[in-house]
């Protein structure tokens, strides 16, 4: 997909940071989404293995985020193929994970 | 060796402003969150504010009592982080102390780290 | 404004278990780190995120946490461990850090 600003990277990691910072508790009632490999995928495969979860205020303003850096509508199961070996894991860790990858790529210069 | 160093403390008149340093050493400081912390005389333990790593926003958010009269910055090319303080009273007065802040510890690259400086005087008195 | 709830003051003899409680409204979705002040010196942290240990603390320190209430445990209190002891966490925005009142921990000699 397109690559997206720098800006923007900036604030979906501050988003990132924002739901995660300090939590302890379950993030959308320990809803469990696909693990993605991340450095294969990207933006829409991230943006397809949240899209199952619903009903969860927390994470919509990521799942709009991750919308405007893809190029087409995502649909659930879309990018099954990138999951890893049919792992699910929940939603705060599947954030935190992203959110780490998502720095590296800045710190690297990716979105520069 | 890992470490803070404050400086900038003295005696200052309510009303009066003061600003103080924090040189950081011996981590990566770019990527850490920082707070500001104070104690009273013979009392508690004080938050004051914090700001996280640029990349991680660069936001800041302040205590009750300080919040408008207080600003915390960072210059991450200097490894040194700021705390101007305006509009001092009297309740001011206190050991103030920076510290790694340990909310943002799993963003930076210090989990379970933890450094604090010795601390620097502030006197409020007319 | 949050606040997080501490006893003052704390005794035990050497060797006993010490427990030191701190409770906060947010604390069931928040974690609770612990610090160690001695006279005249700066804090130690010494348990963060509810449980874990920093290298370097001494194994006989633990901590826990369940519902609104995070738990310092020191497991043979020793006189060195005279100190005042902070609890600190986050409101439930986890933007504004508190700390406890504190709490005096005697280790009567």
């Known amino acids: 997909g397109p690559v997206p600003p720098s800006t923007a990277l900036r604030e979906l990691i501050e988003e990132l940071v924002n739901i995660t910072q300090n939590q302890k508790a379950p993030l959308c009632n320990g809803s469990m989404v696909w693990s993605i490999n991340l450095t294969a995928g990207g933006f829409c495969v991230a943006l397809d293995s949240l899209t199952n979860v619903s009903g969860c205020s927390a994470i919509e303003k990521t799942q709009r985020m991750l919308s405007g850096f893809c190029p087409h509508k995502v649909s659930a199961g879309q990018f099954s193929s990138l999951h890893v070996r049919d792992t699910k894991i929940e939603v705060a860790q599947f954030v935190k994970d992203l959110l780490l990858h998502l720095k590296k790529l800045f710190r690297e210069g990716q979105f520069n | 060796e890992v470490q803070l160093v404050e400086s900038g403390g003295g005696l200052v008149k309510p009303g009066g402003s003061l600003r103080l340093s924090c040189a950081a050493s011996?981590?990566?400081?770019?990527?850490?969150?920082m707070s500001w912390v104070r104690q009273a005389p013979g009392k508690g333990l004080e938050w004051v504010g914090r700001?996280?790593?640029?990349?991680?926003?660069?936001?800041?958010n302040y205590a009750a009592p300080v919040k408008g009269r207080f600003t915390i910055s960072r210059d991450d090319s200097k490894n040194t982080l700021y705390l101007q303080m305006n509009s001092l009273r009297t309740e001011d007065t206190a050991v103030y102390y920076c510290?790694?802040?340990?909310?943002?510890?799993?963003?930076?690259?210090?989990?379970?780290?933890?450094?604090w400086g010795q601390g620097t005087t502030v006197t409020v008195s007319s | 404004s949050y606040e997080l709830t501490q006893p003052p003051s704390v005794s035990v003899s050497p060797g006993q278990t010490a427990r030191i409680t701190c409770s906060g409204d947010?604390?069931?979705?928040?974690?609770a780190y612990w610090y160690q002040q001695k006279s005249g010196q700066a804090p130690v942290l010494v348990i963060y995120?509810?449980?874990k240990r920093p290298s370097g603390i001494p194994e006989r320190f633990s901590g826990s946490s369940s519902g609104t209430m995070a738990t310092l445990t020191i497991s043979g209190a020793q006189v060195e461990d005279e100190a005042d002891y902070y609890c600190?966490?986050?409101?439930?925005?986890?933007?504004?850090?508190?700390f406890g009142g504190g709490t005096k921990l005697t280790v009567l000699g």
């Open positions: 700001i996280r790593s640029e990349i991680d926003g660069g936001t800041t």
């Open positions: 995120e509810d449980s």
């Open positions: 600190h966490s986050t409101d439930s925005s986890g933007n504004h850090g508190v």
């Open positions: 011996g981590f990566t400081f770019s990527n850490a969150w």
């Open positions: 510290a790694t802040d340990q909310v943002g510890a799993y963003y930076g690259d210090y989990y379970g780290m933890d450094v």
């Open positions: 947010a604390l069931p979705e928040k974690y």
